[in-house]
Interface confidence: low
Amino acid sequence: QEFLLRVEPQNPVLSAGGSLFVNCSTDCPSSEKIALETSLSKELVASGMGWAAFNLSNVTGNSRILCSVYCNGSQITGSSNITVYGLPERVELAPLPPWQPVGQNFTLRCQVEGGSPRTSLTVVLLRWEEELSRQPAVEEPAEVTATVLASRDDHGAPFSCRTELDMQPQGLGLFVNTSAPRQLRTFVLPVTPPRLVAPRFLEVETSWPVDCTLDGLFPASEAQVYLALGDQMLNATVMNHGDTLTATATATARADQEGAREIVCNVTLGGERREARENLTVFSFLGPIVNLSEPTAHEGSTVTVSCMAGARVQVTLDGVPAAAPGQTAQLQLNATESDDGRSFFCSATLEVDGEFLHRNSSVQLRVLYGPKIDRATCPQHLKWKDKTRHVLQCQARGNPYPELRCLKEGSSREVPVGIPFFVNVTHNGTYQCQASSSRGKYTLVVVMDIEAFSSH
């Protein structure tokens, strides 16, 4: 008769490091000791006629256990295969590129350490909850990769790696482990350089707006802009509108920046840079400054008029050019009455990179001269009718401007000058018209002949 040795449970599945209660039993009517043959840590819990119970502890790997017993002079055996399952110790998605260009492939790489049985372990790469790749875990550590074409929609998207240990056929369910997500940052940086709008010339200590624009940028808000005049960084205001970035700054030239300079605009995104440069000439245009040796001259004195400007500036004073750029233009004159109030004009011309820039300045000369009464404006003999209105049209000149008074000889009677007045016979007589100032007096005799009013 053939007897059996049963091992229970048959082909169990348990979690790594766990314990297992094993029962060996036989229908052989033998009192022989039943032995459990295994390399695992074992402990006999109880035994009886034809049976023995053992406890296996710290089961870390797959194992085949064997029970054996002597029965009627022979040995019978029974076996069971233990399958150990364990969740991965590490599920890690490799770091993503700091920035990924849209339209280019990047690799998702997931490393899985541990996890058994490997035949039941699957690695899934995810974007949000969308499966990108599903592959079995093979080596130790298992490495699973997927190539992904980066799109705008991926900007800010979380990528993760999930392991699925499928123990459902064994009635244990599906065990899921997920890595920490990693966020992708995608970008678009056009190959074209930014558009840089800047002045060709910039005068020292003056300001001018500078604009730098780049279209087709994504995400525009993440881009960094560097605007500079030479080595002087400009304080830029950056605006984003959709995929367009505009940086505006005010360039102010310093005296030490005179000469050929560059305005630079750098737009950096995703570790890449686009640059635009424009040439600019910083110039200094001093003057023109017109000077009088005596702003207020005495009649007959010599006055020097000079006009100067900065280096490389050509000046022309009242049509007379200076000998060379950067030199002073000068003229001399004997001050006369006719020069009083005369304006001297100076024009300055500076050539900057083939362009001519012009500036003008003027100065007015004052000449001090004694009082005069112009005979042409002051008739010496007046014939007026009694009881009529007239104006004594006399004009004096001089610098300082003289006071003009007409007094009747032999009396203190004064007639107004330049103002209409009512004439009567008492006005008849000779008048001394005197212009006086701090520079002297000038007298002109005016005779008034008043014709009496005839009643018929």
Epitope: E92, A94, P95, P97, R109, E113
Partner: antibody, heavy 119, light 106 residues
Framework: QVQLVQSGAEVKKPGASVKVSCKAS????????MHWVRQAPGQGLEWMGY????????EYNQRFQDRVTITADTSTSTAYMELSSLRSEDTAVYYC????????????WGQGTLVTVSS | QIVLTQSPALMSASPGEKVTMTCSAS?????IYWYQQKPRSSPKPWIY???NLASGVPARFSGSGSGASYSLTISIMEAEDAATYYC?????????FGAGTKLELK
């Protein structure tokens, strides 16, 4: 087997720069981050920074931020550490070390490169 | 940055003695790594994730701790254990090491 082999000892003058190399073998170079650690004579370990050779991403100890540059050449599986504006206090043994993951730490170290800064 | 303070800085022990050294963090860390270094040699990984022994490390070594307080213990000191031990964290940049505990043979 994993190996990290560093370049030989260097003697430099103050103000100069030094570039130390670390050639890796026995594993996939792009998978593991490479760290640089230095040790002044008779002193402890001081972390300088690391590189992820897969992305060329680097992070540095703020103390060396403006003077250290860590690079990697994946075609030769070699990492480099360049330290500029050297001063006498930079005299130290410089190590490269692989980060094997949280379950391992800095699991493999180079043999070290002695850099001496002296006028 | 997280500062790791090791104590004592220097200690000596006789063979067979139990040895404990500590590593205190200025703020809480998840786990600590320990490295052993002997003169004119590169550091060797010794204990990872606070309490796991690296490959080839004798079982007389153990690591424990949590939060901001960690320790390395040698149950029975042996001559070959004389070395400097460094603790290390990487919860945040910069990665930092302790100043080391030098263990001498008495």
């Amino acid at each position: 087997q994993v190996q990290l082999v560093q370049s030989g000892a260097e003697v430099k003058k103050p103000g100069a720069s030094v570039k130390v190399s670390c050639k890796a073998s026995g594993y996939t170079f792009t998978v593991y981050w490479m760290h640089w650690v230095r040790q002044a004579p008779g002193q402890g370990l001081e972390w300088m920074g690391y590189i992820n050779p897969n992305t060329d991403y680097t992070e540095y100890n703020q103390r060396f931020q403006d003077r250290v540059t860590i690079t990697a050449d994946t075609s030769t599986s070699t990492a480099y550490m360049e330290l500029s504006s050297l001063r006498s206090e930079d005299t130290a043994v410089y190590y490269c070390a692989r980060w094997g993951g949280n379950s391992y730490g800095l699991d493999y170290w180079g043999q070290g490169t002695l850099v001496t800064v002296s006028s | 940055q997280i500062v790791l303070t090791q104590s004592p800085a220097l200690m000596s022990a006789s063979p067979g003695e139990k040895v404990t050294m500590t590593c205190s963090a200025s703020s809480s860390v998840s786990y600590i790594y320990w490295y052993q270094q002997k003169p004119r040699s590169s550091p060797k990984p010794w204990i990872y994730l606070t309490s796991n022994l690296a490959s080839g490390v004798p079982a007389r070594f153990s690591g424990s701790g949590s939060g901001a307080s960690y320790s390395l213990t040698i149950s029975i000191m042996e001559a070959e254990d004389a070395a400097t031990y460094y603790c290390q964290q990487w919860k945040s940049i910069p990665l930092t090491f302790g100043a080391g505990t030098k263990l001498e043979l008495k």
